[in-house]
């Protein structure tokens, strides 16, 4: 059976704050848990969502979270279902609202000596307590000429007189918090001697050097006074105008006219009406100078035929807000159709090639007009001017494959070789028109090539096979100098390739024929037993019908290969003594000897006073030190051959004789003693 370990419980919650309804279930098998609100499944939102089996509220909402929650656990396999206890929230909240006139029914009916009732539309749970204010000053309950009813949230003025005139606001507070009226009520109870607004000035926006007019009228008995002030409290009259308002005129009806408006005239103008009694009435209006900034540039746009696209025109900053319209070919775009204006957007539906061109966004206000062009290109699928052709390209020469296409905008061409993208390098170059150049054609360039030409509207491709016309060439070219060992068998290979398999033959350079013990077998010169007379210059000739012949000259030297007569031996020497490493080699041409010590060649010209290489090839090292220890290699070489042999040199301390040892006792290892 399904058992609830934790069940949701009813709880207090605060509007807009976090909350959690807990639910934990134990069951024999897996179950899935979901929540009901008033019997309907709860859908997860960012505000209210399942957290494990519990239901989490990021921000409690008094309207959406009122009702009964229930946790349901279901074993989908058996169909068993268990339901938790019901739980609900006692949501505490407070919400601002306006101050409204409850009695009389309309402001027009308010007369001196009538009863006026105002209601504070702040609501909440638990019910808040209310405080009333007139012109920001708290009204305490129990004052003689007004009463406050907290239950009905009402303020009653009885009887209402001019002294009650003012701005009425209310605030309320509860355990949840505090709120004040979102809209206040101005109570105006006529006292004929109080100034009353007949016509209030309005904010105006004017272009530079244009004129601006503010209207302002008050009424009272006796008639009220009217005065205009500019920002810095400077009075404006027809007799005393401030220096920056030389072109200001105040008319008898209270209107203020400003001509040839300049930036310094912009600002706040105050119209002050003063009755015989009562406070002055101050009305404000602002004079703004019209302005319009530049428009940002458009990037050129590329669209595809048949699609729907939009280009947004961001209106420039300006005062008043500039109006925006689009034009094409000097004609203003309609607000519906296939190509039309929607808000600030240019809309092109089912784009046709003919829609390409320059579209202009215009913005205008009192300060002037701005415009910005956008170039629209309608992309077309490329078409062929010249496809790549199957080609025969000559090895070693540059080769070209065409891929000439046309489209709007200019198409992009890429080449593939054996399905692999060709990246431009020292061998491959793609020209602006799409032609591929292979700088020096090689045999392995003979394969499939494919070019693809693309625009945003689509792409086309074609392929061609390249056949490489091979050069007649030696593969590899024979070494120009070669050695043969005297009295031994020797071979000198020569091979070549070409468009047709070439014939290969050998000749002596002097034109004499090859002796009978020398054979030419399919390009390989074979000496059964090398004699001194076999030395000399030979020519390998490769030829075929279409390509003629090529020649390679080889100088053959007959040599006796190097052997060592004397090889250096493993040598141990006392420190400070002299070491001798012997080495003698023979061969024809007579070999030269070089020594390598501790991985570097010993240069006879830079050996220093301690080392010397004798004519016969031996190496002598005087006054040996431990750092002279290591492997020494004797290298014998001539123009035909090179051979080496090596031996280690050990440098040791001379032992101090012990008393038991006589002066003639031998050292513990073989020594060179000098």
């Amino acid at each position: 059976a399904i058992v609830f370990i934790k069940q949701p419980s009813s709880q207090d919650a605060l509007q807009g704050r976090r909350a959690l309804l807990r639910c934990e279930v134990e069951a024999p098998g897996p179950v899935h848990v979901y929540w009901l609100l008033d019997g309907a499944p709860v859908q997860d939102t960012e505000r209210r969502f399942a957290q494990g089996s519990s239901l989490s509220f990021a921000a409690v909402d008094r309207l959406q979270d009122s009702g009964t929650f229930q946790c349901v656990a279901r074993d989908d396999v058996t169909g068993e279902e268990a339901r938790s206890a019901n739980a609900s929230f006692n949501i505490k909240w407070i919400e601002a609202g306006p101050v409204v006139l409850k009695h009389p029914a309309s402001e027009a009916e308010i007369q001196p000596q009538t009863q006026v009732t105002l209601r504070c539309h702040i609501d909440g749970h638990p019910r808040p307590t209310y405080q009333w204010f007139r012109d920001g000053t708290p009204l305490s309950d129990g004052q003689s000429n007004h009463t406050v009813s907290s239950k009905e949230r009402n303020l009653t003025l009885r009887p209402a007189g001019p002294e009650h005139s003012g701005l009425y606001s209310c605030c309320a507070h509860s355990a949840f918090g505090q709120a004040c009226s979102s809209q206040n009520f101005t109570l105006s109870i006529a006292d004929e001697s109080f100034a009353r607004v007949v016509l209030a000035p309005q904010d105006v926006v004017v272009a530079r050097y244009e004129e601006a007019m503010f209207h302002c009228q008050f009424s009272a008995q006796p008639p009220p006074s009217l005065q205009w002030l500019f920002e810095d409290e400077t009075p404006i009259t027809n007799r005393s105008r401030p220096p920056h308002l030389r072109r200001a005129t105040v008319f008898a009806n209270g209107s203020l006219l400003l001509t040839q408006v300049r930036p310094r005239n912009a600002g706040i103008y105050r119209c002050i009406g003063q009755g015989q009694r009562g406070p002055p009435i101050i009305l404000e209006a602002t004079l703004h100078l019209a302005e319009i900034e530049d428009m940002p540039l458009f990037e050129p746009r590329v669209f595809t035929a048949g699609s729907e696209e939009r280009v947004t025109c961001l209106p420039p900053k300006g005062l008043p807000e500039p109006s925006v319209w689009w034009e094409h070919a000097g004609v203003r775009l309609p607000t519906h159709g296939r190509v039309y204006q929607k808000g600030h957007e240019l809309v092109l539906a089912n784009i046709a090639e003919s829609d390409a061109g320059v579209y202009t966004c215009h913005a205008a206000n009192l300060a002037g007009q701005r415009r910005q062009d956008v170039n629209i290109t309608v992309a077309t699928v490329p078409s062929w001017l010249k496809k790549p052709q199957d080609s025969q390209l000559e090895e070693g020469k540059p080769g070209y494959l065409d891929c000439l296409t046309q489209a709007t905008p200019k198409p992009t061409v890429v080449w593939y070789r054996n399905q692999m993208l060709i990246s431009e390098d020292s061998r491959f170059e793609v020209f602006k028109n799409g032609t591929l150049r292979i700088n020096s054609v090689e045999v392995y360039d003979g394969t499939w090539y494919r070019c693809m030409s693309s625009t945003p509207a689509g792409s086309i491709e074609a392929q061609a096979r390249v056949q490489v016309l091979e050069k007649l060439k030696f593969t590899p070219p024979p070494q120009p100098q070669q050695c043969m060992e005297f009295d031994k068998e020797a071979t000198v290979p020569c091979s070549a390739t070409g468009r047709e398999k070439p014939t290969i033959k050998w000749e002596r350079a002097d034109g004499s024929s090859l002796p009978e013990w020398v054979t030419d077998n399919a390009g390989t010169l074979h000496f059964a037993r090398v004699t001194r007379d076999d030395a000399g210059n030979y020519t390998c000739i490769a030829s075929n019908g279409p390509q003629g012949q090529i020649r390679a000259h080889v100088q053959l030297t007959v040599a006796v290969f190097i052997t060592f007569k004397v090889e250096p031996e493993r040598t141990t020497v006392y420190q400070g003594h002299t070491a001798l490493l012997q080495c003698e080699a023979q061969g024809d041409p007579k070999p030269l000897i070089q020594w390598k010590g501790k991985d570097r060649i010993l240069d006879p010209t830079k050996l220093g006073p301690r080392m010397h290489i004798f004519q016969n090839g031996s190496l002598v090292i005087h006054d040996v030190a431990p750092e002279d220890s290591g492997r020494y290699t004797c290298i014998a070489g001539n123009s035909c051959n090179i051979k080496h042999t090596e031996a280690p040199l050990y440098v040791v301390d001379k032992p101090v004789p012990e008393e038991s040892e006589g002066p003639g006792s031998p050292p513990p290892y073989k020594m060179i003693q000098t």
Epitope: P41, D44, G79, E81, R83
Partner: antibody
């Protein structure tokens, strides 16, 4: 033994109504959800609707309005009321408790 | 409307083969795991194989396994046996007590 037996199937004319019953034995409907599933001849399974342990019902979008699931806990029986029947409602109708326990199904044929 | 798509619709295989059937939902199932697989043979009621995506139902051989999450699920038969040739259905459960079946995959002998 826990089992489900459907009944009430048969031939009905287009536009007509039919009520199928699913009688449960070996358990109480109070604690279980019951599904109705149908299968047209040679076609796949199609979920019709569900009645949960409290008696609340939920339906596939195509079944809303024409089909109604109800239950009588005293008879331990779940019902499927089908109105305005069409030829395409011809199918074997199964009732199932959860995923595991299914009835043998009852055939409904809508034809003139 | 929720749509569950099984692929393939039909599948031919031999005894011993490894078989995979996929099920894709147009929206995520409840808790990302409320998905079951059934086997049905002609004239019989469906038989539960897998529940909650990967749990093996009682009496079902271990060669059947399920995996997936959210809106994409698979049923795998590791080594097909003669008794496994049948039609297989996936069924998803969704927020709001709504359920739906896939169109089915018919597994036949190659």
């Amino acid at each position: 033994e826990v089992q489900l037996v459907e009944s009430g199937g048969g031939l009905v004319q287009p536009g007509g109504s039919l009520r199928l019953s699913c009688t449960a034995s070996g358990f109480s409907l109070h604690n279980y959800v019951m599904n109705w599933v149908r299968q047209a001849p040679g076609k796949g399974l199609e979920w019709v609707g569900i009645i949960d342990s409290s008696g609340s019902t939920y339906y596939a979008s195509w079944a809303k309005g024409r089909f109604t699931i109800s239950r009588d806990t005293s008879k331990n029986t779940v019902y499927l009321q089908m109105n305005s029947l069409r030829a395409e409602d011809t199918a074997v109708y199964f009732c199932a408790r959860g995923l595991y326990l299914w009835g043998q199904g009852t055939l409904v044929t809508v034809s003139s | 409307e929720i749509v569950m798509t099984q692929s393939p619709s039909t599948l031919s295989a031999s005894v011993g083969d490894r078989v995979i059937i996929t099920c894709q939902s147009s929206q995520s199932v409840y808790n990302n795991n409320l998905l079951a697989w059934y086997q049905q043979k002609p004239g019989k009621a469906p038989k539960l194989l897998i529940y909650y995506t990967s749990n093996l139902a009682s009496g079902v051989p271990s060669r059947f396994s399920g995996s997936g999450s959210g809106a994409e699920f698979t049923l795998t038969i590791s080594s097909l046996q003669p008794d496994d040739f049948a039609t297989y259905y996936c069924q998803g459960g969704y927020n709001g007590n709504i359920y739906a079946f896939g169109q089915g995959t018919k597994l036949t002998v190659l």
